[in-house]
Interface confidence: medium
Amino acid sequence: DLNKVFPPEVAVFEPSEAEISHTQKATLVCLATGFFPDHVELSWWVNGKEVHSGVSTDPQPLKEQPALNDSRYCLSSRLRVSATFWQNPRNHFRCQVQFYGLSENDEWTQDRAKPVTQIVSAEAWGRADCGFTSVSYQQGVLSATILYEILLGKATLYAVLVSALVLMAMVKRKDF
């Protein structure tokens, strides 16, 4: 390449508990940093599908060090969803950044090197308000199911025993 290229680093920051409790909304923030040049496209994906509703992205990348002529760039974007949607640990959120540059191995030629697209992503899973993660949520569901089945089994056994005792009592009463 004619000029050095730096792909972005991407991170997703989860919404704050304060925002969720006060507004019943949840804002996820995506931050792409350290890229050069400033040719990027950012998109949000929820459960594998690209979303546009509730998305607010900076109009253009900003220099990380404005005073420097050759500063790397950063770009931020926000995705706002309802608190209940965020608190469902089955929901998957992904911020994807497409970076247009030349890969380290591409040779720059006099007729220009063909730019390549690098995709860098970061993700987050919904988080229940009691601090469940997706894994602990699944484990919790499993535990709850087992507990329910045990209680149901106990109740059934109890019902059978009570029924048996009632029947026995009725038979004894007929004998008298």
């Epitope: 004619l2 000029n3 050069f36 420097l68 007729d111």
Partner: antibody
């Protein structure tokens, strides 16, 4: 601040050699492609040569190919132009220029230039 | 080689009036990445050139908004909405889709 300073110009006889230098400061020299552009007295601009940020790729205008060599020393933040077999038509002000960055193309920073006169 | 042709060769403008410079390339400057590699420079008397416009229409940092670039393919225009005394000099267009070629320049002075 961002600065490019050329040196090494002067009067030289046809067929002789000259080496121009360009000292860079105020930016990360090793991240950018660098160019030499010249301007004959009273004439327009003519691009001469380019070198990639790491020195691995070099290209030249047909008018200087085989005679001029562009090089760089990133440890010294310096760009060079070795000019051999000089001709009268090489007489010009030689500017070094920094590439704008990205996929390349524009020259965003220029030096003040150094005059090379080829004359017997 | 790509040839860049500028018109007019020179231009005399009254301060406050608009000015327009045309630049034509011998082949399209649109590249496969969707960008058009056409640039405008101004060389003021006794100074090195300075970048005004990159990729057809983007003003370089610090360039006044009275300068604007337009065009596509092979035909491009630089416009100065209201010429000021400090705008005098020679304007060059340049392509960088296949190495680098400048137009022959357009000299702008004040009436």
């Amino acid at each position: 601040q961002v600065q490019l300073v050329e040196s090494g110009g002067g009067v030289v006889q046809p067929g002789r050699s000259l080496r121009l230098s360009c000292a860079a400061s105020g930016f990360t020299f090793s991240s950018y492609g660098m160019h030499w552009v010249r301007q004959a007295p009273g004439k327009g601009l003519e691009w001469v040569a380019v070198i990639s940020y790491d020195g691995s790729n070099k290209y030249y205008a047909d008018s200087v190919k085989g005679r001029f060599t562009i090089s760089r020393d990133n440890s010294k933040n310096t760009l060079y132009l070795q000019m051999n077999s000089l001709r009268a038509e090489d007489t010009a002000v030689y500017y070094c220029a920094k590439d704008l960055g990205g996929s390349g193309g524009a020259f965003d920073i220029w030096g003040q230039g150094t005059l090379v006169t080829v004359s017997s | 080689d790509i040839v860049m042709t500028q018109t007019p060769h020179s231009l005399s403008v009254t301060p406050g009036q608009p000015a327009s410079i045309s630049c034509k390339s011998s082949q399209s400057l649109l590249y496969s990445d969707g960008k058009t590699y056409l640039y405008w420079y101004l060389q003021k008397p006794g100074q090195p050139p300075q970048l005004l416009i990159y990729e057809v229409s983007n003003r370089f940092s610090g360039v006044p908004d009275r300068f604007s670039g337009s065009g596509s393919g092979t035909d491009f225009t630089l416009k100065i909405s209201r010429v000021e005394a400090e705008d005098v000099g020679v304007y060059y267009c340049m392509q960088s889709i296949q190495l680098y070629t400048f137009g022959q320049g357009t000299k702008v002075d004040i009436k």
